[in-house]
């Protein structure tokens, strides 16, 4: 028997520095977690103790903090090189700055193979990107060889900016011939490493003949066997065992997100490459693990540029940006409109001639808007200003919801109106009218939504049985502020870009902004 240790990360999302327990900015260092310096300590400890170790990343290193905003992926290549990753799969967020924003900082600089079997380049891009990422890589590990086959969410064109010259094929269809090829070349230990979410990971384990282990990402899935060490609730045991269609037991793993855990899976293979046993657990990277001094020093050196960036002007406002709780928790506020407009703008994807865009709607809890911005400071808006407005380090995500769920959400928005509570929704691409004289749960008297399948966008009444795409904060997608119906009833959830980054990009693009209060949210006569 031959034993392999797989160390894995996924959805790190630019958390190069240690973070608080909820993966936001580290405040009390003695209680902080993760970060590449701490990760390196643990990885090196395991490499020294065990003979056959692979360090893998299942995608979405890009996007999430000011590190990515400033360094644009160069930080990913640099620190992943320093940690000596063995392979990485492309995630959807690796395309956030377009193909060039992937090629130059990451693909050309990474000293580890970057993989995806289901992304095919065409046209002029084919020769430019040739060899910069691979469908698979065969790695010598100890006395054996291991094949790593990559995959990426086929939804990437709707979630990011891969352009028109990359085709995202069905994962299973694309993986099978690559695995078959490796088998014919006597590679009998094969890991599928990819970024399509836990449901697809399980399908790959079930359907792709010859895959021995699946290491996934995208859905931020936390798996654990035994008593979990922090706040995350396990979605299943680690590893999650799938019985394949040809009767094999295939371990599937994922390691939550944000570099908080290091996935640790031990696999035992027989001489024919069959998995005999698999066991392990994610390792919580808490403060009991010291940060590696040399990596930490490097982080501090790279940090300097971030501090300078946060005070530079992004753009100007010529109006007061009303982000006060007195406004945003009670009525339409122009800060809410600005943020929602930025959220929609960030999700413009012309992927189908029938649609002007794939999504037109935004909702945003008023309680998530934490500060106004005064225009009387020469109109200057900085990252620092935006960090005061959006201090929680969240993301603006894409969900699919039925109209009936949206209706419930808007009822929840005003179910206890008047108490300055955070659930009051700011909107984009939506016209809502409330009648507060009616009883809670029956206060939405009009709800019109902007069409997407149209050449001239216009507002139509919400249809209860129709499925709609909506951009919203991850806080809401996870049921925050009492929006349990969103969490329980959403049909799809894809994590998006860092909130501040979305707004800062929009402001930089517009240069001068003047958001108005324009009648998106109304109260019917006599009730307000």
């Amino acid at each position: 028997a031959w034993e392999l240790t797989i160390l894995h990360t996924n959805d790190v999302h630019s958390r190069l520095e240690q973070t608080s327990e909820d993966s936001s900015k580290c405040v009390n260092a003695s209680r902080c977690m993760g970060g590449v310096a701490r990760l390196f300590t643990k990885v090196q400890q395991i490499r020294r103790a065990e003979p056959n170790v692979l360090l893998l990343d299942a995608g979405d290193q890009y996007q999430g903090t000011i590190w990515f905003t400033v360094y644009k992926g160069a930080e990913v290549a640099h620190f992943m090189n320093a940690l000596r990753y063995d392979a990485m799969a492309l995630g959807n967020h690796e395309f956030d700055n377009g193909v060039e924003g992937l090629i130059e900082p990451l693909l050309k600089e990474a000293k580890f193979p970057i993989l995806s079997a289901n992304i095919k380049a065409k046209g002029p891009l084919a020769s430019q990107i040739s060899g910069l990422y691979l469908p698979y890589k065969v790695l010598p590990v100890g006395d054996e060889v291991v094949g790593i086959v990559g995959y990426t969410s086929k939804e990437t064109p709707f979630l990011s900016n891969p352009g028109t010259n990359l085709v995202f094929e069905d994962e299973i269809t694309a993986l099978q011939p690559e695995v078959d090829k490796l088998k014919t070349l006597n590679v009998n230990k094969i890991i599928a490493l990819g970024h399509s979410g836990f449901e697809m990971d399980k399908l790959i384990a079930q359907k792709v003949r010859g895959v021995d282990v699946v290491v996934g990402g995208h859905s931020n899935t936390f798996l654990y066997t035994g008593n979990p060490p922090s706040k995350e609730v396990p979605a299943g045991k680690y590893p999650f065992i799938v019985t394949s269609d040809d009767g094999r037991k295939v371990p599937v793993v994922q390691a939550y997100a944000f570099g908080k855990y290091l996935g640790y899976l031990k696999i035992e293979f027989d001489e024919r490459g069959n998995v005999i046993s698999s066991h392990g657990n994610p390792i919580l990277l808490n403060s009991s693990i010291p940060e590696d001094p040399s990596i930490k020093a490097d982080i501090n050196k790279w940090r300097i540029k971030l501090d300078n960036y946060s005070t530079q002007e992004l753009g100007k406002t010529i109006v007061y940006l009303d982000g006060s709780s007195q406004s945003c928790r009670f009525r339409e506020c122009n800060m809410g409109n600005l943020i929602c407009d930025a959220m929609i703008n960030n999700n413009l994807r012309h992927t189908d001639e029938m649609f002007w865009n794939h999504v037109s709607m935004c909702i945003l809890n008023g309680g998530g808007i934490r500060s106004p911005i005064d225009e009387r400071n020469n109109g200057t808006i900085t990252w620092e200003n935006l960090a005061a407005v959006l201090p929680f380090g969240g993301t603006f995500d894409l969900v699919q919801l039925k109209g009936s769920t949206l209706k419930k959400a808007f009822e929840h928005s005003v179910h206890r109106y008047g108490q300055s509570t955070g659930e009051f929704l700011q909107v984009g691409g939506i016209h809502v009218v409330y009648d507060l004289s009616r009883k809670p749960g029956d206060r939405v008297v009009k709800l019109d939504v902007l069409c997407t399948k149209c050449r001239v966008p216009s507002y139509d009444p919400l249809k209860m049985d129709e499925v709609y795409k909506v951009i919203l904060p991850n806080f809401l997608a996870n049921g925050g502020d009492g929006f349990q119906m969103i969490k329980d009833e959403l049909l799809r959830h894809d994590s998006g870009d860092q909130d501040i980054n979305v707004v800062s990009t929009y402001i930089s693009k517009m240069k001068v902004i003047y958001p108005a209060v324009e009648g998106r949210i109304k109260f019917s006569t006599g009730s307000h």
Epitope: L134, V138, P140, V141
Partner: antibody
């Protein structure tokens, strides 16, 4: 700068064994795999095997059917290639070569001529 | 094992010429191809890896292209020091295999 310095030329009788050394300097020895390649007179290059100096793991070209053994001494930053049951067709220049992150051979030793003759 | 076939086996050219050497693999090698230059009595020197990535310090007149099974090494303007034997090698799978070499001679 990276340097790989190999041991000197050897003359061996058929059936004997030869052990060639390769001393590495200018980089962290355990950070890169070391391959061994040979070149018989007028022939193409032939890959023999690979060692991971970090854990001693080896992968061999099956053509050499247990005749080749690659080892390393990390304290001396040196890799070794031993070829046993020598025959006249093993007469060749033997090279060690460091592999880069992608497993292409980026630095080569100067070569060691092994002559097998009765 | 994957067979690597180079063409031509030998080639005569003059300083300033543009020269192309091809290498064909017996099956798809996933861009895992390198090119080496070897001068008489010397060890091979890596020029290009991953089919088209030029090694630091190698003159930009050398370039690599190709994917799948067909690959090309191009020298855009031959210099006197470029006369040597060139080898391609696949490192996609084990065992690693080399082409038979292309000897580039002065016309």
């Amino acid at each position: 700068q990276v340097q790989l310095v190999q041991s000197g030329a050897e003359v061996k009788k058929p059936g004997a064994s030869v052990k060639v050394s390769c001393k590495a300097s200018g980089y962290t020895f355990t950070d890169s795999n070391m391959d061994w390649v040979r070149q018989a007179p007028g022939q193409r290059l032939e890959w023999m095997g690979d060692i991971n100096p970090n854990n001693g793991g080896t992968i061999y070209n099956q053509k050499f059917k247990g005749r080749v053994t690659i080892t390393r001494d990390t304290s001396a930053s040196t890799a070794y290639m031993e070829l046993s049951s020598l025959r006249s067709e093993d007469t060749a220049v033997y090279y060690c070569a460091r592999t880069n992150w992608d497993y292409a051979m980026d630095y080569w030793g100067q070569g060691t001529l092994v002559t097998v003759s009765s | 094992d994957i067979q690597m076939t180079q063409s031509p086996s030998s080639l005569s050219a003059s300083v300033g010429d543009r020269v192309t050497i091809t290498c064909k693999a017996s099956q798809d090698i996933n861009s895992q191809l390198s090119w080496y230059q070897q001068k008489p009595g010397k060890a091979p020197k890596l020029l290009i890896y991953r089919a088209n990535r030029l090694i630091d310090g190698v003159p930009s007149r050398f370039s690599g292209s190709g994917s799948g099974t067909d690959f090309t090494l191009t020298i855009s303007s031959l210099q006197p020091e470029d006369f040597a034997t060139y080898y391609c090698q696949q490192y996609d799978v084990f065992p690693r295999t080399f082409g038979q070499g292309t000897k580039l001679e002065i016309k």
